[in-house]
């Protein structure tokens, strides 16, 4: 059985719309499926590597690494998106290209970085971890590390980095797929919102999903005692 | 307010050092992405970039110069230096410190300037 | 090192007439910066990335270009105008000028 709840909420393009969330209902009335891997059902995505997962999340990465940062022209905030999904009446997409990005580092002005933009989150404004010396971030925003301490600057005079960002990485079903969304449309999907990433690349969902010991490699699967709990 | 005020010996001979000072406010060379550059102007002349220093004591010298050229800071004074080795009259010139800044821009620019202290190289 | 010529050296204009001095690059170069010195008075920028304005330049300034030709234009030329103006590249060590146009008042 299926029980399905519809209701207003907030979307990345700033409106109210209607969204249906799909539950599957415990046929035995207990658990719902999320809350039995998270208590260490066999769920064999948990265990060992699941194919299906793994190309949902290179496709989603593929996806990731040609984004670029859609700031709405009234100001109202900005999301992380496909070149696609921003409005080219209402908005800017800013989105590095041929030689429009910024130098890898002060010491290498020759080569731009051509990954990126990325909404609130610049190698020029990270203090930690810092893009210099031996730890320059890759030109491939999706190998790009979380920022946990911005420069200390009210505004950077970025597009990307002074504007309100709306959205940010939500892990949503067993699935472990992400998606960039608001606080309040993942909630409702009764997922996992991450205040701390900007990018889907730098969270890892099925780690979340499956609860317990976190995984000894983000992205490796290795939860075999969960043979033994169930 | 961002002020930067340079200063110097004024007169000095051939084969001397000159050593200048760039005593800034507004500003912390502490700070992530703040830089100070020393560019000079001949009278008269057009403006040639010297040296700069950043944050985390980075340092860039102008290659045609760079024998005699060693720039550092004083952090906690608000302060950045240049000492240029074995001078010449071909350096009497106005020295300006300017700050830099990546504000809004790819690369960064010297977005404030000092006022200059002029230098003169005479025996 | 990259080698900035700008033209033309010295040039004269009418209050309200419209001013375009160009800097060419021997290589090509990302963006260009304008600075503008008056006399007796240190510089100060006026355009980064080769087009944005800098805080406090009235907008009858522009700077356009790419590659190895950028320009700066005065839209109508005022008396406080008058001043010599420089170009710069950061896209390469070492950081170069262009030698200045000078603009004089007519």
């Known amino acids: 059985a299926q029980h399905v709840t519809t209701q207003l909420v907030l979307r990345n393009k700033g409106v109210y719309e209607s969204v249906k969330y799909i539950q599957q209902e415990n046929f035995w009335i207990g658990p719902s499926s999320i809350d039995l891997i998270h208590l260490g059902a066999k769920f064999s995505p948990c265990i060992r590597k699941d194919q299906q997962i793994e190309q949902l999340v290179l496709r989603e990465r593929d996806l990731e690494r040609d984004s670029g940062c859609c700031v709405q022209n009234d100001h109202s905030g900005c999301i992380q998106t496909q070149r696609k999904d921003c409005s080219e009446t209402l908005a800017t997409f800013v989105k590095w290209q041929d030689d429009t990005g910024p130098p890898m580092d002060k010491s290498d002005l020759g080569q731009k970085r051509t990954s990126g933009a990325v909404c609130h989150q610049d190698p020029r404004t990270c203090e930690e971890p810092a893009s210099s010396g031996a730890h320059i971030w890759p030109d491939d925003i999706t190998k790009w590390p979380i920022c946990t301490e911005q420069a200390k600057s009210n505004r950077t005079g970025f597009l990307h980095m002074d504007c309100q960002i709306k959205g940010r990485p939500c892990c949503i079903s067993t699935k472990g797929s992400c998606e960039i969304t608001t606080r309040e449309y993942c909630e409702f999907m009764h997922g996992y919102f991450h205040e701390e990433a900007t990018l889907c690349s730098q969270v890892h969902c099925l780690d979340k999903v499956c609860g317990l010991l976190p995984f000894l490699n983000p992205e490796v699967p290795d939860q075999f005692y969960r043979l033994w709990l169930s | 307010q961002v002020t930067l005020k340079e200063s110097g010996p004024g007169i000095l001979q051939p084969s001397q050092t000159l050593s200048l000072t760039c005593s800034f406010s507004g500003f912390s060379l502490s700070t992530f992405g703040m830089g100070v550059g020393w560019i000079r102007q001949p009278s008269g002349k057009g403006l040639e970039w010297l040296a700069h220093?950043?944050?985390?004591?980075?340092?860039y010298y102008n290659s045609a110069l760079k024998s005699r050229l060693t720039i550092s800071k004083a952090t906690s004074k608000n302060q950045a230096f240049l000492k240029i080795a074995n001078v010449d009259t071909a350096d009497t010139a106005t020295y300006y410190c300017?700050?830099?800044?990546?504000?809004?821009?790819?690369?960064?620019?010297?977005?404030?300037w000092g006022t200059g202290t002029t230098v003169t190289v005479s025996s | 090192q990259v080698v900035l010529t700008q033209s033309p050296a010295l040039m004269s204009a009418s209050p309200g007439e419209k001013v375009t001095m160009t800097c060419s690059a021997g290589?090509?170069?990302?963006?260009m910066y304008w600075y503008q010195q008056k006399p007796g008075s240190s510089p100060r920028v006026l355009i980064y990335?080769?087009?944005n304005l800098a805080s406090g330049v009235p907008a009858r300034f522009t700077g356009s270009g790419s590659g190895t030709s950028y320009s700066l234009t005065i839209s109508r030329m005022e008396a406080e105008d008058a001043a010599s103006y420089y170009c710069?590249?950061?896209?390469?060590?070492?950081?170069?000028f262009g030698a200045g146009t000078k603009l004089e008042l007519k």
């Open positions: 300017a700050r830099i800044s990546n504000y809004g821009s790819n690369y960064w620019y010297f977005n404030v």
């Open positions: 290589s090509s170069v990302s963006c």
């Open positions: 220093i950043w944050w985390d004591d980075e340092k």
């Open positions: 710069q590249q950061w896209n390469s060590y070492p950081l170069t």
């Open positions: 990335d080769t087009s």
